[in-house]
Interface confidence: medium
Amino acid sequence: AITEAREEAKPYPLFPGPLPGSLQTDHTSLLSLPHTSGYQPALMFSPTQPGRPYTGNVAIPRVTSAGSKLLPPLAFKHTVGHIILSEHKDVKFNCSISVPNIYQDTTISWWKDGKELLGAHHAITQFYPDDEVTAIIASFSITSVQRSDNGSYICKMKINNEEIVSDPIYIEVQGLPHFTKQPESMNVTRNTAFNLTCQAVGPPEPVNIFWVQNSSRVNEQPEKSPSVLTVPGLTEMAVFSCEAHNDKGLTVSKGVQINIKAIPSPPTEVSIHNSTAHSILISWVPGFDGYSPFRNCSVQVKEVDPLSNGSVMIFNTSASPHMYQIKQLQALANYSIGVSCMNEIGWSAVSPWILASTTEGAPSVAPLNVTVFLNESRDNVDIRWMKPLTKRQAGELVGYRISHVWQSAGISKELLEEVGQNNSRAQISVQVHNATCTVRIAAVTKGGVGPFSDPVKIFIPAHGWVDHAPSSTPAPGNADPVLII
C-alpha cells in the first residue's frame, strides 16, 4: 500500500497540459521505480527520443530567443504539507518546479530535518522539457516506514549559484505506543511506599497509561504518560506492568517483580578446612539473601565438654569471603559451630551446627628441678629434672628437648638434644673447657614443644680443676638459677 502525496494537476501556464501521469507506480514510462543503490543522479528524458532516459549531469539547452524576456521568480509548487501514515506502510511524495530553459546545470537534492539525504534513498528526478520550460519532478519514496522516518523533508535546487528551497513536507509515522521508560524490578521493605514509573510516546498522542498489578488493573481510569504509580506498601511479592494506549492500539510493558525484603535464610554446608591446637578454619555457603545484601555474619562456638559452662563464644565477621578462622580455642577440645548472617532486615536463623575438634597443644609448663653437674671424668655433664605436670590438652608426652649453650672467651655455641619421654636424666659431652655451659629443658608432645625451663649454668674448668658440685633450679622452676662450683 503506497501513501502517495500528489500535487493538484493544475496546468502551469508555460507548460502544455497537466504534468504527465500522477506518479503512480504503474506508469513505467516515468521510470518511477525505486533505485536501491546510492543517491541517484538526475534522470533526464531526451527530447529527441521520448521515453528513452539518459543519465548524467543535466544541462538544459539554452534558449537564446527568450534571453530578453523578464523571467518570473523560480519557486517550487505548493504540495502536500503533512503526511500521516502508519508504521510499515510505503510512502511516496514529490516536489515539482518548472524551470525556463535558459537555465542550466540544475540539481535537486532532498533534505530531512536540515541534513542532506545521501546514500541509499529512493530518490528519482524526472525532467519533462518543452519549448520554453522544463518541468522537473523530484520524487522520494520510503518503503516500510519506521518512526525514525518522522521529520520535515524539503527539496533544494541549485541553479546559477542560487538556492531554491521547497515548502517542507512533514512526515508523521504513527504506530503503537513506544516505551521510553518502563517500570524496574525492585526489592522493597514490607509495608513501605515505593514508586514505579512508566512513560510511552506516540505518535499519535496522547498516550494513556493503565497500571496492572498481578494481572489486575490498578487504575480504572487511564493516566497520561508519563505516569508514576506510588504503591503504599506490599506484604507479599507482586508483579507490576503498565499498558500504554493510543489511537493505534495498546503496548504492554515488561512485567517487573517487586520482591519483599526478608531476613536471610540460614547458611548451609558449614565445613572445617583446617584445625590446629587453638584455631579452626571454617567456611560456609550463604543462604538466600532475602532480597537484601548481606551485611555481616556471626560465627557461634560452643564447647561440647560436659564440664564446660555451655557459654557461647560469638565472633563477628564480614559477609564475604564466606570463611573465618576461629582463634583463642583450647587445645584438644570439642566444639559445636554454627553460622548466622544478617541483612538490613535482620539475622538469619543459625546454620545446622557442626562438630569440630582442636588438635593437642604443646605443653604449657617446663620440666621442674633441673640440676646440672660435671661428672668425675670431666668429659660429661649430667642433667637431671622432674617431669612437668602437663594438662590433658597438651597431649601425651613424647620426650624432652635439651638446649645447652657453651660460652668461653669470644665463642658461643648452642646445641640441641632430644631424649625420650621415659627419661628424667641425660648426659652430654663437654664441648669446651674453661667455659660456661647453660642448660634449658622443654617438654615435647605431638602438639609441639613447650616452654623451656629457666637456664641453669655450670662452669667447666680447665683440665686439672677439681669440682663436682651441681647446679640446679629450685623446684618451682622459675627462681633464679644457682651456679655452684
Epitope: N208, K224, S227, T230
Partner: antibody, heavy 123, light 107 residues
Framework: QVQLQQSGPELVKPGASVKISCKAS????????MNWVKQRPGKGLEWIGR????????NYNGKFKGKATLTADKSSNTAYMQLNSLTSEDSAVYFC????????????????WGQGTTLTVSS | QIVLTQSPAIMSASPGVKVTMTCSAS?????MHWYQQKPGSSPRLLIY???NLASGVPVRFSGSGSGTSYSLTISRMEAEDAATYYC??????????FGGGTKLEIK
C-alpha cells in the same frame, strides 16, 4: 502562585442549564487534571469528575453522568462545567480543584481550589 | 464505590490539647488525603498521601494509617484550628470519595 478564579454566583430556573468557568493561572494548565467538586449547604463534598485539558479527556462520577459536562479551552487556560436540566437538588457551591503532585502521579489529591461558585436553582 | 466514615462527627477541644480524628474506609484504600474547611471558604489541603504535610501547613498536623483505618492528629490545638475536616480516599478507582466531615470546635 497558582490561582483558580471561578465565575460568579448563578440564579437559574428549574429545567435550565448553566455553564460555570474556572480560569487557571501560573502553572501549565494543559498538563494537570482539573477536578470539580459539589458541596450542598451544610453538607459534605462530592467529586463530580475531572478533565485533562491537554486533550479533553474526561472521567465522571457515575452519579453525575448526563448531569455535568466538562470542557476546557487551552488557549484561555479555562475549564468549564455545564450543568443541565437543573433542579433544586443542584443548588450548591461548586468548586474547581487542580490535581496535585507531579502532573503525572496517579495519586489524586487537590492542592489548589477555586473560591467556589454558588448555584441557586429556584423558580 | 468506597464509603468513608469520619468520627466523631462533632468534637470540641481546649487550646493546647492533642486532638485525633479518624476516617474508616469500607474497603482498603491506597492513600488518604485530609482537607480543612472553614465556613465560607474553599477546602484547603492539609495532608496528602496519608502522611505528607502540604505546603504551608503547620507541623502540629500529622496523618497516619493504612488499609481501611486512617487518622488526623493535631498535637496542640489552637483556636485557628476550629474548622470542618474532610478525608478523601485514593484507591485508584474513581470516584474519589470524601468522608462526611468532622467538625472541630474550640472549647
Amino acid at each position: 502562585q497558582v490561582q483558580l478564579q471561578q465565575s460568579g454566583p448563578e440564579l437559574v430556573k428549574p429545567g435550565a442549564s448553566v455553564k460555570i468557568s474556572c480560569k487557571a493561572s501560573d502553572y501549565e494548565f494543559s498538563r494537570s487534571w482539573m477536578n470539580w467538586v459539589k458541596q450542598r449547604p451544610g453538607k459534605g463534598l462530592e467529586w463530580i469528575g475531572r478533565i485533562y485539558p491537554g486533550d479533553g479527556d474526561t472521567n465522571y462520577n457515575g452519579k453525575f453522568k448526563g448531569k455535568a459536562t466538562l470542557t476546557a479551552d487551552k488557549s484561555s487556560n479555562t475549564a468549564y462545567m455545564q450543568l443541565n436540566s437543573l433542579t433544586s437538588e443542584d443548588s450548591a457551591v461548586y468548586f474547581c480543584a487542580r490535581k496535585g503532585g507531579y502532573y503525572y502521579s496517579i495519586s489524586n489529591y487537590f492542592d489548589y481550589w477555586g473560591q467556589g461558585t454558588t448555584l441557586t436553582v429556584s423558580s | 464505590q468506597i464509603v468513608l466514615t469520619q468520627s466523631p462527627a462533632i468534637m470540641s477541644a481546649s487550646p493546647g490539647v492533642k486532638v485525633t480524628m479518624t476516617c474508616s474506609a469500607s474497603s482498603s484504600v491506597s492513600y488518604m488525603h485530609w482537607y480543612q474547611q472553614k465556613p465560607g471558604s474553599s477546602p484547603r489541603l492539609l495532608i496528602y498521601d496519608t502522611s505528607n504535610l502540604a505546603s504551608g501547613v503547620p507541623v502540629r498536623f500529622s496523618g497516619s494509617g493504612s488499609g481501611t483505618s486512617y487518622s488526623l492528629t493535631i498535637s496542640r490545638m489552637e483556636a485557628e484550628d476550629a474548622a470542618t475536616y474532610y478525608c478523601q480516599q485514593w484507591s485508584s478507582y474513581p470516584p474519589y470519595t470524601f468522608g462526611g466531615g468532622t467538625k472541630l470546635e474550640i472549647k
